[in-house]
Interface confidence: low
């Protein structure tokens, strides 16, 4: 386990510890990296270690969620003397080592980002052979994934006393603001539920009582864009028809 101190230099490698004669285990990562969903992101991680000129077997690992216990998303192994770190695990094939672990660089590229990738990542290096040692970043790097709004569900549901209600669920980061418009509504924020536990990027807005037939439109907007979807309410013979 590790501690973290402030380093005010811009360059990850331009720190006093790299020029000191007695190196210690340390890792340098930025607190946060931001990227848009669909794009790629680079998670920088460099390290120092006390085993001068180590060229034995090594393993590079990245975890998600929490250090030590979080699930591995990437793992590669380099044989003695080899600069090639052979990938043994790349979750969904989207993780690729950019750095060279032999040169103290474990930087990772994540392809095709999704909102679900928005979490903290921890780099780890393990030495095996003459030297048995390992080190893992403690606080890790937060990958902040941003995304324009996307409406994931819109529906009309029956409610008591032959009434109907409409639900609109959208995702995005920052979490989008939702608004309903429709017959006799104008623009209404309706009953917006805050992001659900475990679904931090999902927001739901409810129209509790649809009083008129016609088209009801849900608009989701954040700083990156907006999205719309509609449902239609036709009350004939006590039934409803809905399409988007």
């Amino acid at each position: 386990f590790v501690r973290t101190k402030i380093d005010t230099t811009e360059n990850l490698l331009n720190t006093e510890v790299h020029s000191s004669p007695a190196q210690r285990w340390s890792m340098q990562v930025p607190p946060e990296v931001s990227a848009e969903a669909g794009d790629a992101a680079v998670l920088p991680c460099t390290f120092t270690h006390p085993h001068r000129h180590y060229d034995g077997p090594l393993t590079a690992i990245w975890r998600a969620g929490e250090p030590y216990a979080g699930p591995q998303v990437f793992r590669c192994a380099a044989a003695r003397g080899s600069e090639l770190c052979q990938t043994a695990l790349s979750l969904h094939g989207r993780f690729r080592l950019l750095g060279n672990p032999r040169r103290n660089d474990l930087s990772l590229r994540v392809e095709r980002l999704a909102l679900a990738d928005d979490r903290r990542y921890f780099c780890r290096v393990e030495f095996a052979g003459d030297v048995h040692d390992r080190y893992e970043s403690r606080h890790g790097v937060r990958l902040h994934v941003t995304a324009a709004p996307r409406i994931v569900n819109i529906s009309v549901l029956p409610s008591p006393a032959h009434a109907f209600r409409a639900l609109c669920t959208a995702e995005g980061e920052p979490p989008p603001a939702l608004a309903w418009s429709g017959p006799a509504l104008g623009n209404s924020l309706a009953a917006v539920r805050s992001p659900r536990e475990g679904h931090g990027h999902l927001v739901t807005a409810e129209l509790p009582a649809l009083t008129h037939d016609g088209r009801y439109t849900c608009t989701a907007a954040n700083s990156l864009g907006r999205s719309e979807a509609s449902v239609y309410l036709f009350r004939f013979h006590g039934a409803s028809g809905a399409s988007t």
């Epitope: 101190k5 380093d7 340390s26 890792m27 340098q28 607190p31 390992r134």
Partner: antibody, heavy 128, light 107 residues
Framework: QVQLVESGGGVVQPGRSLRLSCAAS????????IYWVRQAPGKGLEWVAV????????YYADSVKGRFTISRDNSKNTVYLQMNSLRAEDTAVYYC?????????????????????WGQGTTVTVSS | DIQMTQSPSSLSASVGDRVSITCRAS??????LNWYQQKPGKAPKLLIY???SLQSGVPSRFSGSGSGADFTLTISSLQPEDFATYYC?????????FGPGTKVDIK
Amino acid sequence: QVQLVESGGGVVQPGRSLRLSCAASGFIFSSYDIYWVRQAPGKGLEWVAVIWHDGSNKYYADSVKGRFTISRDNSKNTVYLQMNSLRAEDTAVYYCARDTHSYGSRIYYDYNYGMDVWGQGTTVTVSS
Amino acid sequence: DIQMTQSPSSLSASVGDRVSITCRASQSISSYLNWYQQKPGKAPKLLIYAASSLQSGVPSRFSGSGSGADFTLTISSLQPEDFATYYCQQTYSPPFTFGPGTKVDIK
């Protein structure tokens, strides 16, 4: 000057609850991890819990897991230890302590350090 | 969890003596080890961090060595104010366990 002051100790019956506070001053509180360590009468030090500088992670000793909760309010420069279902073996002096080094907003520079600033301790006695 | 053991549990020494205390971890902890000094009725004081680094303000007669699972705290010339109890602590992975302590008293 840099200091930590614990409060909230006292005598409590087994099974009851108590909340300890640790008030910090003289440093940028939100940049430091904070620990609780306890010492039973005549015994050694026992590490109890840690909360990261931003409150994002917490770890506990097995002996208190599920019963104690560490939390912090960075706006009040205070860390709390909520102790539920207290047992006789929880009787101890409780110290809060600060990690040696702080966390910056630019680069996390990982090391392994110790606890360099300690409070004076607050006594918790669990007895019927 | 990682268990820490210390030896001896107590020792008697005289002012000017060279004193060594050993600490052993139940598994390799690299250099993630700290040493503390505690006097009766007082809070502990950090002496050594990262196995061998002297904490600011601590006299140079204190030194730490070791890596992996075996560590040593050495006081090169014991002074009257050094009579206290010494604890090692691992910070390799939580819970960050302490050793049981070594009490150093006057012979």
